[in-house]
Amino acid sequence: MMTGTIETTGNISAKKGGSVILQCHLSSTMAQVTQVNWEQHDHSLLAIRNAELGWHIYPAFKDRVAPGPGLGLTLQSLTMNDTGEYFCTYHTYPDGTYRGRIFLEVLESSVAEHSARFQIP
């Protein structure tokens, strides 16, 4: 039985040209995390963090994606096209797969505030 829950940074906004941290956290389970996948709204994989192999950033995102902090992901040099949904998928033993959702809005405004709060999606 899957007892865990994924907490995410929820709906966040950030300035064009700036950076943002995408963060998910798995709680309420003793399952062991073996891999975390990060994917974009169009289901393209940004990065994978495998327990044994470490991080793999996909070539299309190599210049703009940095691993971490932790199991999270940092998106840099944001463009308006980065607006949309992002998903973290936690592969765990023995529970199976947990999935969290984050919505990122990239704002043109130079006064846009970076807001982030943890919430259960």
Partner: antibody
């Protein structure tokens, strides 16, 4: 080369305790969950439970909640199974087995097994 | 808990025969099933995982298939070294469990 090497056979009296070790080499112990499996003489395989090698938290199958303890010493890359208040019916071969971290979690490497005999 | 029922518990076949072992799950487990071979006095070794994926180094005469909650291990041409007991295992969620085993004897 990945290897799980278990401690040798044990002969114990009823009521005694035993600690079986499983030394992992050729990979990072803390990256792969570790399972324990029991096989009584002439019987099939019984999954006893597993230990989260990242946090050290154990989880036990229903028949193994009372006298069985899984533990780790990451400094010597070793997993342990301790059985207390031994009974004759604990006589079995005990295996440690590593969980593969593919998406389906089969047991890809096994120790050679440790025979524990409980007899007065 | 999900139960696995393995059949037959024993079979005797000749070298070169096609051998089939079945494992039925009491509920759907998707492809979360593995097959293991255990030779006398030895530890088990994985043959098939994910219901159909052949473990590296395992001879191609071994194959796995699934149909709903029924899983099959096939040995296309039995060899003398295949004398062993074969187990299926459910891999998804706690608790894991094994089938009762199928002992394969060479005639």
């Amino acid at each position: 080369e990945v290897q799980l090497v278990q401690s040798g056979s044990e002969l114990k009296k009823p009521g005694a305790s035993v600690k079986v070790s499983c030394k992992a080499s050729g990979y990072t112990l803390t990256n792969y969950p570790m399972n324990w499996v029991r096989q009584a003489p002439g019987r099939g395989l019984e999954w006893m439970g597993w230990i989260n090698t990242n946090t050290g938290s154990p989880a036990y199958a229903q028949d193994f909640t009372e006298r069985f303890v899984f533990s780790l010493d990451t400094s010597v890359t070793t997993a342990y199974l301790q059985i207390s208040s031994l009974k004759a019916e604990d006589t079995a071969v005990y295996y440690c087995a590593r969980t593969a971290i593919t998406s389906v979690y089969h047991f890809d490497y096994w120790g050679q097994g440790t025979l524990v005999t409980v007899s007065s | 808990d999900i139960q696995l029922t393995q059949s037959p518990s024993f079979l005797s076949a000749s070298v070169g025969d096609r051998v089939t072992i079945t494992c039925r799950a009491s509920q759907g487990i998707s492809s979360y099933l593995a097959w293991y071979q255990q030779k006398p006095g030895k530890a088990p070794r994985v043959l098939i995982y994910g219901a159909t994926t052949l473990q590296s180094g395992v001879p191609s005469r071994f194959s796995g298939s699934e149909s709903g909650t029924e899983f099959t291990l096939t040995i296309s041409s039995l060899q003398p070294e295949d004398l062993a007991t074969y187990y299926c295992q459910k891999l998804n969620s706690h608790p894991s469990s094994f089938g009762q085993g199928t002992k394969v004897e060479i005639k």
